[in-house]
Interface confidence: low
């Protein structure tokens, strides 16, 4: 008699997560008498997926009525597929007995599950960096299948090239994760800049997922300091101005020192934003020249975002009297702007 064949026509089937998978199996003969069972995997550790005779398999249903006479179609449908269902499924014929004896297995159908990647999560550096420094951003997405995936980085719409990307694991798995690091060189104009991590996958139908991060969270733009002395007033008072410009973030403390002694401390708050996202702040100090016999050394000291202080000092000459109303005494700038120490 002709040898019984167990035919699984599809070597592989691919299904989107959440959908149903149909695994086809037919036999070439009704004899010998005995049941069909479905297993995932082979060998002693195989997992029983469906047994017509007994057991409770809520997600598995036969495609045709296996109880009807002369039925040779033992295909099954598995509903609500998840990545954990991936694997090779075998349709196995048993010969009726006590116990039933395994007679023949189909060649197996590999079920692969197409699962969407999770929304990319972008994280930036733990501490701020200044312009011309390089910072790293990391993008992660998980739970996708198949393994093939494309990840791109953009800064203000321009693709970044200094990127390192890994997909894990290297071998076969029910689902995969991607982690990518992009290195970005900061500029002073980057307060309003944004980096985007874009993930494309076969499950997304050409509509990639994006994760974003604002460079404002990663950048520190140190201030420029400029100190100027206004005209001498009739009441022998000099108005000295400290202009602090182009800084970010807003967290800034300004201290005036007269001959090394603290005169006044101010904190920046509710400042208007420049077009490039930075801030400016102007502070002034009135110095009563007639109260001093010697020249007065004034220092504008700025602490920005917890960084070491930046000083700008100059001397107000009090020896050169009389003081004509409307005369303009230039400040002698004896300080240095130490912005580059960060």
């Amino acid at each position: 008699e002709e040898e019984l064949q167990v035919i699984q026509p599809e070597k592989s089937v691919s299904v989107a997560a959440g959908d149903s998978a149909t695994l086809n199996c037919t036999v070439s003969s009704l004899i010998p008498v005995g049941p069909i069972q479905w297993f995932r995997g082979a060998g002693p550790g195989r997992e029983l997926i469906y047994n017509l005779k007994e057991g409770h398999f809520p997600r598995v249903t036969p495609v045709s009525d296996p109880t009807k006479r002369n039925n040779m179609d033992f295909s099954i449908r598995i509903s609500n597929i998840t990545p954990a269902d991936a694997g090779t499924y075998y349709c196995v014929k048993f010969r009726k007995g006590s116990p039933d004896v395994e007679l023949k297995s189909g060649a197996g159908t590999e079920l692969s599950v197409r699962a969407k990647p999770s929304a990319p999560v972008v994280s930036g550096p733990a501490v701020r960096a200044t312009a011309e420094h390089t910072v790293s951003f990391t993008c992660e997405s998980h739970g996708f299948s198949p393994r093939d995936i494309t990840l791109k980085w953009f800064k203000n719409g321009n693709e970044l090239s200094d990127v390192q990307t890994n997909v894990d694991p290297a071998g076969k798995s029910v689902s995969y994760s991607i982690r990518s690091t992009a290195r970005v060189v900061l500029t002073r104009r980057d307060v309003h800049s944004q980096v985007i991590c874009e993930v494309a996958h076969v499950t997304l139908q050409g509509d990639p997922l994006r994760g974003t991060a604002n460079l404002s969270e990663a950048i520190r733009v140190p201030p420029f300091l400029e100190v100027t002395q206004q005209s001498m007033r009739a009441d022998n008072q000099v108005n000295v101005t400290c202009q602090v410009t182009k800084f970010y973030p807003q967290r800034l403390q300004l201290t005036w020192l007269e001959n090394g002694n603290v005169s006044r401390t101010e904190m920046a708050s509710a400042l208007p934003e420049n077009k490039d996202g930075t801030y400016n702040w102007t502070s002034w100090l009135l110095v009563n020249v007639s109260a001093h016999r010697d020249d007065v050394k004034l220092t504008c000291q700025v602490e920005h975002d917890g960084q070491p202080a930046v000083n700008k000092s100059f001397s107000v000459k009090v020896s050169a009297h009389p003081k004509e109303q409307g005369s303009n005494t230039a400040a002698e700038n004896t300080g240095t702007n130490e912005r580059n120490i960060y």
Epitope: S14, G43, P146, D148, K172, V202
Partner: antibody
Framework: QIQLVQSGSELKKPGASVKVSCRAR????????MNWVRQAPGQGLEWMGF????????TYAQGFKGRFVFSLDTSVSTAYLQIGSLKAEDTAVYYC????????????????WGQGTLVTVSS | DIQMTQSPSSLSASVGDRVTITCRAS??????LAWYQQKPGKSPKALIF???YRYIGVPSRFSGSGSGTDFTLTISSLQPEDFATYYC?????????FGQGTKLEIK
């Protein structure tokens, strides 16, 4: 039935280039990755890399970066291997081989192979 | 790269013999291992994937086993058409690598 049909043997001079084709029959080219494998005369099998037929993105093994280019023309279900600046040591049979597994672009076991294309480089 | 070492490099056997070819990986490849048969002048033919699963149409006398680093291909009863060169291949990690081959000859 499923077949990978490769172009015929080539005899080339050193410095020339060659383009080997591999046509997929009996299945959809873009459902399976296409690998390229080299076998020098009397030697074993050496994996050159593969092309993701869905995105067109090639992956090259270390010794095959630069002069070797994998490409596709999905309109004619064909993958190509181009070798530039041929050297005598490029003389070998080149096989295309399909990766097992639907939508599996990640290398893997090769269930179907082309018949091979002998490329001979000689002056 | 993962090195795949087959042993023996060649062996002679007779029709009806049971033959075992071993393949050792230089690091763990799980069960991501395949076996191929190649006859002179022909392209390789896939026999086994995932270390132990036969492809459709491959006779049941061919079986594979193993996981991790040690694998075997067993031919339970040699047939005349089985004399060929056999290769193992790991596909756990890039680059994919093959063993050097085992030539099975008629005694």
């Amino acid at each position: 039935q499923i077949q990978l049909v490769q172009s015929g043997s080539e005899l080339k001079k050193p410095g020339a280039s060659v383009k080997v084709s591999c046509r997929a029959r009996g299945y959809t080219l873009t459902d399976y990755a296409m690998n390229w494998v080299r076998q020098a005369p009397g030697q074993g099998l050496e994996w050159m890399g593969f092309i993701n037929t869905y995105t067109g993105e090639p992956t090259y093994a270390q010794g095959f970066k630069g002069r070797f280019v994998f490409s596709l023309d999905t309109s004619v279900s064909t993958a190509y291997l181009q070798i530039g600046s041929l050297k005598a040591e490029d003389t070998a049979v080149y096989y295309c081989a399909r990766t097992r597994g639907y939508y599996d672009f990640d290398g893997g076991a090769f269930d179907y192979w082309g018949q091979g294309t002998l490329v001979t480089v000689s002056s | 790269d993962i090195q795949m070492t087959q042993s023996p490099s060649s062996l002679s056997a007779s029709v009806g013999d049971r033959v075992t070819i071993t393949c050792r990986a230089s690091q763990n490849v799980g069960t991501h291992l395949a076996w191929y048969q190649q006859k002179p002048g022909k392209s390789p033919k896939a026999l086994i994937f995932s270390a132990s699963y036969r492809y459709i149409g491959v006779p049941s006398r061919f079986s594979g086993s193993g996981s991790g680093t040690d694998f075997t291909l067993t031919i339970s009863s040699l047939q005349p058409e089985d004399f060929a060169t056999y290769y193992c291949q790991q596909y756990n990690t890039y680059p994919l690598t093959f063993g050097q081959g085992t030539k099975l000859e008629i005694k």
